[in-house]
Amino acid sequence: ESGYAQNGDLEDAELDDYSFSCYSQLEVNGSQHSLTCAFEDPDVNTTNLEFEICGALVEVKCLSFRKLQEIYFIETKKFLLIGKSNICVKVGGKSLTCKKIDLTTIVKPEAPFDLSVIYREGANDFVVTFNTSHLQKKYVKVLMHDVAYRQEKDENKWMHVNLSSTKLTLLQRNLQPEAMYEIKVRSIPDHYFKGFWSEWSPSYYFRTPEINNSPGEMD
């Protein structure tokens, strides 16, 4: 079957809502950047629909996206990262809808990893550490991190701490004793770039110790 729409197909297409959103990931694979777009409406029939980006590219005028199930994806070194590009949904060579976007304003960082929590008995606190691939990157190096933790039994009662470093101290006195906690972290560009929260890191689980009363203390 031809990838080109018949006139009837175009008329039908024009009735649909082709709103879409995109995010970029810079230096996601060595010096390669990626751009991912998807339709806002998950029920859009994507047969014959293509995405194309034009402008603010190096050495080429336009690039076509690859389709992976319901998302559209490019991995390339050819993003100039200066100025606005035009991203269009096309059918049969005709643009249905377009957006002008500066790719440095829709950056989604990679998820943090290696999250761990160490209890320091003498200090009566928990040291939370994690890693991020962005420390090694040329562009998106400065991130704000959101550490979220909750007592496992409190399903929706998340506590959040924002920080720019990859180390956080939680005081034992601010946590319930003898309780299981879940903790996770995500990142967002904080300076020079704009965009979206990363995916959450895998959760880490830790248990708080019971309160040990000193010999002189009353129950």
Epitope: A56, I82, G83, K84, D102, F193
Partner: nanobody, 118 residues
Framework: DVQLVESGGGLVQAGGSLRLSCESS????????MGWFRQAPGKEREFLAA????????HYSDSVKGRFTISRDNAKNTVYLQMNSLRAEDTGRYYC???????????WGQGTQVTVSS
């Protein structure tokens, strides 16, 4: 009504330095890419350098890489071109441009003249 005003040009000896400034009165300056170009007598206008909205990303032509540096101050609505190790062939009129939108610069200044004597 004037939107981009370049300054800092002049006569300089080969090997010397100059710093050009371009002040913008365009309201979207802090979210716009900026660029510097030059036009030598009898030649086409050539791209020299560009900088992204935040200053984090820069791009240079091979002819000025390592000698010229583009920077910006979003609080002052100004973009700069620091030019070192100037050569006679750098002589020309220097223009700044704003808002690189799908491969077209939307706004242009009137330019400032730079003359490098050997």
């Amino acid at each position: 009504d004037v939107q981009l005003v370049e300054s800092g040009g002049g006569l300089v000896q080969a090997g010397g330095s100059l710093r050009l400034s371009c002040e913008s009165s365009i309201s979207t300056f802090s979210s716009d890419a900026m660029g510097w170009f030059r036009q030598a007598p009898g030649k086409e206008r050539e791209f020299l350098a560009a900088i992204g909205w935040s200053g984090a990303v820069t791009h240079y032509s091979d002819s000025v890489k390592g000698r010229f540096t583009i920077s910006r101050d979003n609080a002052k609505n100004t973009v700069y071109l620091q030019m070192n190790s100037l050569r006679a062939e750098d002589t020309g009129r220097y223009y700044c441009a704003e808002d690189y939108d799908t491969d077209v610069w939307q706004y242009w200044g009137q330019g400032t003249q730079v003359t490098v004597s050997s």
